[in-house]
C-alpha cells in the first residue's frame, strides 16, 4: 500500500520540497503534539460494563517502542447487580496507528512504515441470535 | 526498506535511539486491512453505548480519512431497548500516530503527528456521590 501522492490539482508541489530518492520518503519522527497532555478519562476500563485490562508491548526496533493493548476481562458484560451476564458480549474496539519499524540486514539498517492494529478498549454488544435447524 | 550503511565498526556502534529523520520505503507494511470501521463490524450499532461515525478528511495527512466516533446517547441501552440514564455512554479515546506533510503539500516528506481520536463508546456505571 503506497502513500498517495497529493492528487488535488490545486496542490502545487512547492519549490521547498526536499529532494528524496525514488521509492522512498523523508520522515521526521520528532512528533508534532508529542508533549500535549490529552485529557483521556482514566479508569473507564474498570467502570465499564465491558471492563478491560491493559498490557504494554515493548519492541526496541519499533518507534514508538511502547504500544499499549487492551484485553476484555469478561466474555459477557457486567449487569446492574455486578454479575456477568453472558447473554451479552464484551467485544474489543480496535484502531489502526502507524509505527516505524527498524530492520537490520548485516551491518545495514533500514526503516519501514507499518500499520499496527491496537485494541483500545471494549464495548458491550447484544449478539445477533440465529436459530439453527 | 531503504538500506542505510552503518559505520565500519557496526557491531559496537549500535544506536539504541531512532535518528530524528529517517528515509522510509513508500510501501506501508501490513495493511490491506479495511480502514472503514462501518464495514469491519457493526458494533457501533449493536453496542449498549452505540455511536455514530464521522468522516474526518485531511489531504495533508496520511491516512487522509479518519473515522471519529460520537456516542449516540447520553445514557446506555438497557435490556428493554430503552435509554437508561443511570449509566453513561462515554467515548473511548486513543492517541494514534499519523503522517503530516511537511513542508505542506510536499508529496514525499512527512512528519509524525500524534492525534487523539474517539474510536467507539463504552457504557460506564458512574460512582455516585451525595452532596450534603
Amino acid at each position: 500500500r503506497k502513500i498517495p501522492k497529493v492528487g488535488h490539482t490545486f496542490f502545487q508541489k512547492p519549490e521547498s520540497c526536499p529532494p528524496v530518492p525514488g521509492g522512498s520518503m523523508k520522515l521526521d519522527i520528532g512528533i508534532i503534539n508529542e508533549n500535549q497532555r490529552v485529557s483521556m478519562s482514566r479508569n473507564i476500563e474498570s467502570r465499564s460494563t465491558s471492563p478491560w485490562n491493559y498490557t504494554v508491548t515493548w519492541d526496541p526496533n519499533r518507534y514508538p517502542s511502547e504500544v499499549v493493548q487492551a484485553q476484555c476481562r469478561n466474555l459477557g458484560c457486567i449487569n446492574a447487580q455486578g454479575k456477568e451476564d453472558i447473554s451479552m458480549n464484551s467485544v474489543p474496539i480496535q484502531q489502526e496507528t502507524l509505527v516505524v519499524r527498524r530492520k537490520h540486514q548485516g551491518c545495514s539498517v533500514s526503516f519501514q512504515l507499518e500499520k499496527v492494529l491496537v485494541t483500545v478498549g471494549c464495548t458491550c454488544v447484544t449478539p445477533v441470535i440465529h436459530h439453527v435447524q | 526498506g531503504i538500506t542505510i550503511p552503518r559505520n565500519p565498526g557496526c557491531p559496537n556502534s549500535e544506536d539504541k535511539n531512532f535518528p530524528r529523520t529517517v528515509m522510509v520505503n513508500l510501501n506501508i507494511h501490513n495493511r490491506n486491512t479495511n480502514t472503514n470501521p462501518k464495514r469491519s463490524s457493526d458494533y457501533y450499532n449493536r453496542s449498549t453505548s452505540p455511536w455514530n461515525l464521522h468522516r474526518n478528511e485531511d489531504p495533508e495527512r496520511y491516512p487522509s480519512v479518519i473515522w471519529e466516533a460520537k456516542c449516540r446517547h447520553l445514557g446506555c441501552i438497557n435490556a428493554d431497548g430503552n435509554v437508561d440514564y443511570h449509566m453513561n455512554s462515554v467515548p473511548i479515546q486513543q492517541e494514534i500516530l499519523v503522517l503530516r506533510r511537511e513542508p505542506p503539500h510536499c508529496p514525499n516528506s512527512f512528519r509524525l503527528e500524534k492525534i487523539l481520536v474517539s474510536v467507539g463508546c463504552t457504557c460506564v456505571t458512574p460512582i455516585v456521590h451525595h452532596v450534603a
Epitope: 478519562s41 473507564i44 | 453513561n88 462515554v90 458512574p126 460512582i127 455516585v128 456521590h129 451525595h130
Partner: nanobody
C-alpha cells in the same frame, strides 16, 4: 468536592410554568453532563432531562418532551430547566445531578419539591 446549588421549585397551577436552576462549583472538575431526575411518591426515581457538556446536546424523557426545555450556562457551570404546560403528574421531588470526569462520577443534589395543583 463538587457542590450543587439549586433554586426554583414550589407550588404551581396546572398549565403553569416553573424554572429550576442548578449550579456546580467546588475545585477543579470537568463536566460531562448535568440534568434532573424526579421522584414521585411511591414511584422510582425517573430521568427528566439532561445536557451533555461537550456539545450541548439535550436529552428528554418522553413524558416531558415538548413541554420542558433544558439549557446551560457554560460560564457558571449551571443548567436551567424551563417547565411549561405543567400537569399534576409532574408533581415530584426534582433532583439535580452533575456527571464529572468523563462521566465516571455522579453527584446528586438535594431534592426540590415541585407541586402542580389547583
Amino acid at each position: 468536592e463538587v457542590q450543587l446549588v439549586k433554586s426554583g421549585g414550589g407550588l404551581v397551577q396546572p398549565g403553569g410554568s416553573l424554572r429550576l436552576s442548578c449550579a456546580a462549583s467546588g475545585g477543579t472538575f470537568s463536566l460531562f453532563a448535568m440534568g434532573w431526575f424526579r421522584e414521585a411518591p411511591g414511584k422510582e426515581r425517573e430521568f427528566v432531562a439532561a445536557i451533555r457538556w461537550s456539545d450541548g446536546s439535550s436529552y428528554y424523557a418522553d413524558s416531558v418532551k415538548g413541554r420542558f426545555t433544558i439549557s446551560r450556562d457554560n460560564a457558571k457551570n449551571a443548567v436551567h430547566l424551563q417547565s411549561n404546560s405543567l400537569k399534576s403528574e409532574d408533581t415530584a421531588v426534582y433532583y439535580c445531578y452533575a456527571d464529572v470526569q468523563g462521566g465516571l462520577h455522579r453527584y446528586w443534589g438535594q431534592g426540590t419539591q415541585v407541586t402542580v395543583s389547583s
